[in-house]
């Protein structure tokens, strides 16, 4: 059931979230550009089948459509999705020296965004139980798989962030 009006979310929280989404989108775009320029891996759609075989998951945001937004469920899915991407980004570690700093910053910015969401849920008395462990993360058997995985993870993350941004912008409207 929909929980509480969107107006129960402070404007300052929503603006902070929108900032953070834009920051992570920038980090993700930088990672995609470097993967394209360095390894000519420029088209995630060409790697979809490989993504299935590597077991790279998607994070749902099914509780967040603007028509029937469930506040607790939506924030929880946002947090769970960010938690998932933290694990996926961790699995990419060692992707290449050139990409390391960009990946490092992306990883921390995703973690900080997850913190912002959780902090707000806690203040609203709807904090989810702490997730004790990550689910099974993809294992990359080769450098190519890790780089291709990087393209797919960055692409999935960007899609997740686009939806997140739309939802947050909708909530921020008076």
């Amino acid at each position: 059931t929909p929980l509480g009006p969107a107006s129960s979310l402070p404007q300052s929280f929503l603006l902070k979230c929108l900032e953070q989404v834009r920051k992570i989108q920038g980090d993700g775009a930088a990672l995609q550009e470097k993967l394209c320029a360095t390894y000519k891996l420029c088209h995630p759609e060409e790697l979809v089948l490989l993504g299935h075989s590597l077991g790279i998951p998607w994070a749902p945001l099914s509780s967040c459509p603007s028509q029937a937004l469930q506040l607790a469920g939506c924030l929880s899915q946002l947090h769970s999705g960010l938690f998932l991407y933290q694990g996926l980004l961790q699995a990419l570690e060692g992707i290449s020296p050139e990409l390391g700093p960009t990946l490092d910053t992306l990883q921390l910015d995703v973690a900080d965004f997850a913190t912002t969401i959780w902090q707000q849920m806690e203040e609203l008395g709807m904090a989810p139980a702490l997730q004790p462990t990550q689910g099974a993360m993809p294992a990359f058997a080769s450098a190519f798989q890790r780089r291709a995985g990087g393209v797919l993870v960055a692409s999935h993350l960007q899609s997740f962030l686009e939806v997140s941004y739309r939802v947050l912008r909708h909530l921020a409207q008076p």
């Epitope: 913190t115 912002t116 702490l130």
Partner: antibody
């Protein structure tokens, strides 16, 4: 209220290792990253790295990547920083500081732990 | 790594007078999201650093409004409109645009 309490001063010989602890209270420990920063005598601040306790992921400043190890124990809300192969230049005050975004970043610091490396 | 450079390194000030500290970054800290990822910290004698300013121009909680900060993408200024005795210490600018986070060398403010 948020508090970060660090372990006491240490004196170590060159080549040895040191492990500094930072016990957090007043907030949900796994949710926030914990950063480590050091300050050599009369010098500025230098970022060592951070740990994300929720997934056990640590990231390091390239300068410390081979010698620093950051860990966290969520059951005791304690973060640890271990530095190996100590040399005299590692003599410094080591701080833990809670991460976050915007006005949350380094809004809370431990009191610092002085590590002296001397033969 | 982004290099942060502060000036002056020492700043003697008479109480009640204004003070100004400069900080320059080797790369623009202005992100495409419109936020400038520049912070100021103050370390009072014998204490841990404390947050003064976040995202270039925002005062942290509890910071007196005699402090202000402004700048462009690479050049920043921390101003104290009227220095008080409790303002003594070392002021550090820092960037958190990207890892590794980096700090300026510090500016020691002392009372004349």
């Amino acid at each position: 209220q948020v508090q970060l309490v660090q372990s006491g001063a240490e004196v170590k010989k060159p080549g040895a290792s040191v492990k500094v602890s930072c016990k957090a209270s007043g907030y949900t420990f796994p949710i926030y990253t914990m950063h480590w920063i050091r300050q050599a005598p009369g010098q500025g601040l230098e970022w060592i790295g951070y740990i994300n306790p929720s997934i056990g992921y640590a990231n390091y400043n390239q300068k410390f990547r081979d010698r620093a190890t950051l860990t966290a124990d969520t059951s005791t809300s304690t973060a640890y920083m271990e530095l190996s192969s100590l040399r005299s230049e590692d003599t410094a005050v080591y701080y833990c500081a809670r991460g976050g975004y915007g006005d949350s970043l380094f809004a809370y610091w431990g009191q610092g732990t002085l590590v002296t490396v001397s033969s | 790594d982004i290099v942060m450079t502060q000036s002056p390194l020492s700043l003697p000030v008479t109480p009640g007078e204004p003070a100004s500290i400069s900080c320059r970054s080797s790369k623009s800290l202005l992100h495409s999201n419109g936020i400038t990822y520049l912070y100021w910290y103050l370390q009072k004698p014998g204490q841990s650093p404390q947050l003064l300013i976040y995202q270039m121009s925002n005062l942290a909680s509890g910071v007196p409004d005699r402090f202000s900060s402004s700048g462009s993408g690479t050049d920043f200024t921390l101003k104290i409109s009227r220095v008080e005795a409790e303002d003594v210490g070392v002021y550090y600018c820092a960037q958190n645009l990207e890892l590794p986070y980096t700090f300026g060398q510090g500016t020691k403010l002392e009372i004349k």
